[in-house]
Structure formats: C-alpha cells, structure tokens
Interface confidence: low
C-alpha cells in the first residue's frame, strides 16, 4: 500500500495589481496530477498581515484569491494542496506548505508620513478627508493622495486638494459613483527635495464615516397636561429615515437637564405645570442597520418655549 | 485607553536575574516601541533600550548590552525585560514606555516596578 | 553619548509666575529638520508624563501653558503661569540617538 502524496501548487505569489491595498494571491495547480484526473482538488489558502494574530483561511478551486490588505505592514501567505477523501479512498490528503511574503519597501523614516489622517463623508454625498504634514517635513514637502474602490479601473489621483501655506492637506473628493459598503483604499504619498516621505495606507468604507446634516423643523406639542411632543424632520439628503438615531438634549427651566437616544422623529416628555421654559436641540448619527459606525450631527438649532401656556401653542420654525 | 500593566515588585539577591513584565492594551500593540527606563531612589532617569514589538528589532544602551534581554509575545501583548548578574546599584524602579517613531518621545507609561537588589 | 545639561537644577516660583527651564546637549539633536528633544513632568511616586515633543508639540491633554522651543543644541521649556499642580521635577530628553538621554532634571518648589 503505496502512501498517496501531493505536491503544494506552484508559483505562488502575491501580485499588487496598483490598487493601494487591494491584492491578488495566484498560484498553479501542483506538479504530478496525473494520477487524480477524475478528481477535483481543492486549495487551502491562509493570509495575514504580518503582526496579526489570526491568518484569514479559504478553501478553493480556484487559483487565484483577492483580497484587502494593510500596507503599512507586510503580507504573508501560504498555502497546500487538499486532495479529497473521495479521491484518495480513505482520509483527506495535504501537501506540504507552499508560502510567499509581500511588502512595499518603506521609504523615509515614520515622522515624515501624514498625521491625522481624518476622513468624513457628509451626508452620504461629499467625501473629504485631511491630514496634518509629518513632524518636521519642510514646505516643498508636497503630499498627494490616490483612491480606488473596487468599479474604479485605476487608482485616481485627487484633482481638488485642500491647500495650507501652499502644501496639499486635504482632499475634496468628486462624486463617488457606487462606492459606500466596499473597502475604499487611500494612499498619501509625498515628495521632497531633501529627503524621502514615508507613504501612509488607509481602507475603510464610506457609509461608517457619515457625518448626516443635522434635523430640522423641530415642533412641540401639547398631549395632555403634563405630556408635551417634541417631533422634528430628517434633513434632505440622501438618507433614508430609517438609518437615523437621534440624541435629544432638553433643558426645563435652565435646571433639569434630559439626554436620551431615541430611533424615531418624536420624544414625549413628562412635565409640570410649573414649567416655564423648555429647549431642546436634536442631533443625528446613521444607526447599526445601516452601517458599523457613524459620526453624530452638528446639533440642530435650538427650539424653546417660554412664558405661554404650551397647550394654546405649538412651535414650529 | 492605553494601558501598561508592569509585575510587581521583586527582591532579588546580588548575582541573580529578575525579568519585569509590561502587558499592553487599548491600542495595536505591534504598530509601537516599547521602552525600557529605570530611575534609581532619589535619581534621575536612564534609558536602558526599546524593542519593537512588530519585528522584535531591539536597541539597547551600550551599558547595559551584555546583561539585557528584551522579548515581546504578540499573542498576549507583553514586553518581557531581563537584566541578569545584578548588583545593588541596579535597585531601581523599572519603567516601560510606549513610543511610535524616534521623534514622538515616550507617550505613555507603566506605574514602574521596583527592583532591590540585596543580600 | 549625547550629554544634556539642564539648568537650573532647582527652581523656586510662586502660583502665577512664569517658570522656564533650559537644555543644552552636548551636540546637535537636530535631523531631517526634527528637533529630537522631549520633555517631561514627574511628580513623587508617579511615572514621568510626555508635556513636549519634537522641541515644541505639545502631548495630548496638556494644558496650552506648557511650551517648547529651541533648535540644534539649546531647548527652553517654559510655564506660562504656573499652577499648584505644576510644582514637580522636570526632565529634558533626546531621542536622536541611541543612547536615548535624560537631563538631570529641574526641581520646581513653591516660594
């Protein structure tokens, strides 16, 4: 009884294919299948950043992978052939480990890179992201910022940078044509004459940076004696009504102060007759059914009632 | 937040070797340096070495070179520092500290862990 | 070694007086236009705490009292007006090479 071997696939590699982060892995099928034509073999592909605690691991037919990396760090992967029980009468059989790395040489030393990198996509319309040059980095330092997505062909240079004693500190981004709940991958690189500039990587996905605009058209009702509603609008925008929380501050008479979080466009509030003033301001944030995070709203304008009985009135502005 | 958590305190006998623990959290624990500085009673402050916690790259003062041993396990997020044939004079309180590049000194802390060294 | 000397050793000052401390190393701790000149603040029992970095950014949380300033081999921090809680011992640093080095430290005590 000869035991059955398998050798690992061949030339496997990592490819960047130029999209700031988003890499190929492809290999070929291993030499010496002759003797399992009738038999479908599968791959068992592991992957990491290197400093990672956990490898990421796929199981294929395929001989390729893709997938989002960070490249401020280097890659490892490796990866064997799995030849089914069906194929082998008796117990999976495994090859040896076939393993490649990947990283994109680091130029110049880390103080050189952007510092706080920070990027908002307002209303889920207009992407901007900002930075702070590296420490020390003289003024003909310039920074440039690249951008893909997966539907774009090409990274994209930024063509609208926000400028600073004539250096690139940020970015306003043209119109992004379906892109939000996709990795979207972001290098700053730079240039000097004087020494090298340490790129920097970024990948998030735009619909957990919204910053929404803030309500608007808050009102008061009256519902019973010691029960007052306050309602208020979604602003315009693209953002569905039910991707909203709100945040509600409301101040009685300059004392009491109320926060709650609430998920619709209404709070009812127990009161007092003696009550004599009421604010309130509202605030928004896109909520977990519709993306992972999210930036809260400036707050609204504030909304008062003073001096008058609340049941003969409602406020609306 | 960011928080070092250091061993606590040990005494040790002249000759012997003591290994101080410094347990990271609250931030990505291999993108940081961790530092290593001790300040004996009443003194000032001396850089012993740093080790990066990414690669296990280490850097250590050429005073201490042959006594030191600076190690990092990622999988629980500690820096180990072992100073061995200990002499009185090396009773101090150990510090590690937190940095990023060169240029962004020493960020955050541990509460330090004392060392005595006697017979 | 790079040597740093900080001047004065010690420090008496009243709550609302302006403090500065001065560093001088022994050589340049200039590179790539960086100053590598940090300062710290430490208080009995406690470990020292970032105030500056680079000569003259300030650490998170600081309070805008502190300040840097300095190139190459002379570095002052200054303590716009010093509060009760600003009466420590403090310590200049250079990071330019291995080994990194401390000053002495300046001991500020209330008049």
């Known amino acids: 009884d000869t035991e059955i071997k398998v050798n690992p696939p061949q030339d496997f590699e990592i490819v960047d294919p130029g999209y700031l982060g988003y890499l190929y892995l492809q290999w070929q099928p291993p030499l010496s299948l002759d003797h399992f034509k009738e038999c479908t073999v599968e791959y068992e592909l592991k992957y990491r950043n290197i400093g990672s605690e956990t490898w990421k691991t796929i199981i294929t037919k395929n001989l390729h992978y893709k997938d989002g990396f960070d490249l401020n760090k280097g890659i490892e992967a490796k990866i064997h052939t799995l030849l089914p029980w069906q194929c082998t009468n008796g117990s999976e059989v495994q090859s040896s480990w076939a393993e490649t790395t990947y990283w994109i040489s680091p130029q110049g030393i880390p103080e050189t890179k952007v510092q706080d990198m920070d990027c908002v996509y307002y209303n889920w319309q207009y992407l901007l992201c900002s930075w702070k040059p590296g420490i020390g980095v003289l003024l003909d330092t310039n920074y440039n910022l690249f951008y893909w997505y997966e539907g774009l062909d090409h990274a994209l240079q930024c063509v609208d940078y926000i400028k600073a004693d004539g250096q690139n500190i940020g970015c306003r981004f043209p119109y992004l044509e379906a892109s939000d709940y996709k990795d979207f991958y972001i290098c700053v690189n730079g240039s000097s004459e004087n020494k090298p500039i340490r790129s920097s990587y970024f990948t998030f996905q735009l619909q957990n940076i919204v910053k929404p605009l803030p309500p608007v058209y808050l009102t008061f009702t009256r519902e019973s004696s010691c029960e007052i509603k306050l309602k208020w609008s979604i602003p315009l925008g693209p953002i569905p009504a039910r991707c909203f929380d709100y945040e509600i501050e409301i101040r009685e008479d300059d004392t009491t102060l109320v926060t709650a979080t609430v998920e619709n466009e209404t709070y009812t509030l127990k009161t007092t007759n003696e009550t004599r003033q009421l604010c309130f301001v509202v605030r928004s944030k896109v909520n977990i059914y519709c993306s992972d995070d999210g930036i809260w709203s400036e707050w609204s304008d504030k909304q008062c009632w003073e001096g008058e009985d609340l049941s003969k009135k409602t406020l609306l502005r | 937040q960011v928080q070092l958590v250091q061993s606590g305190a040990e005494v040790v006998k002249p000759g012997a070797s003591v290994k101080v623990s410094c347990k990271a959290s609250?931030?990505?624990?291999?993108?940081?340096?961790m530092n290593w500085v001790r300040q004996a009673p009443g003194q000032g402050l001396e850089w012993i070495g740093r080790?990066?916690?990414?690669?296990?790259?280490?850097h250590y003062n050429q005073k201490f070179k042959d006594r030191v041993t600076m190690t990092v396990d990622t999988s629980t997020s500690t820096v180990y520092m072992e100073l061995s044939s200990l002499r009185s004079e090396d009773t101090a309180v150990y510090y590690c500290?937190?940095?990023?590049?060169?240029?962004?000194?020493?960020?955050?802390w541990g509460q330090g862990t004392l060392v005595t060294v006697s017979s | 070694d790079i040597v740093l000397t900080q001047s004065p050793s010690s420090l008496s000052a009243s709550v609302g007086d302006r403090a500065t401390i001065t560093c001088r190393a022994s050589?340049?701790?200039?590179?790539?236009?960086?100053?590598?000149m940090n300062w710290f603040q430490q208080k009995p029992g406690k470990p020292p705490k970032l105030l500056i970095y680079?000569?003259?950014r300030q650490g998170s949380g600081d309070p805008a009292r502190f300040s840097g300033s300095g190139s190459g081999t002379d570095f002052t921090l200054t303590i716009s007006s010093l509060q009760p809680e600003d009466f420590a011992t403090y310590f200049c640093?250079?990071?330019?090479?291995?080994?990194?080095?401390f000053g002495g430290g300046t001991k500020l005590e209330i008049k």
């Open positions: 500290a937190r940095g990023y590049g060169d240029a962004y000194g020493m960020d955050h």
């Open positions: 609250g931030y990505t624990f291999t993108n940081y340096w």
């Open positions: 080790i990066d916690a990414y690669a296990g790259e280490t």
């Open positions: 050589e340049s701790v200039d590179n790539y236009g960086i100053s590598f």
């Open positions: 680079a000569a003259s």
């Open positions: 640093q250079q990071s330019k090479e291995v080994p990194w080095t």
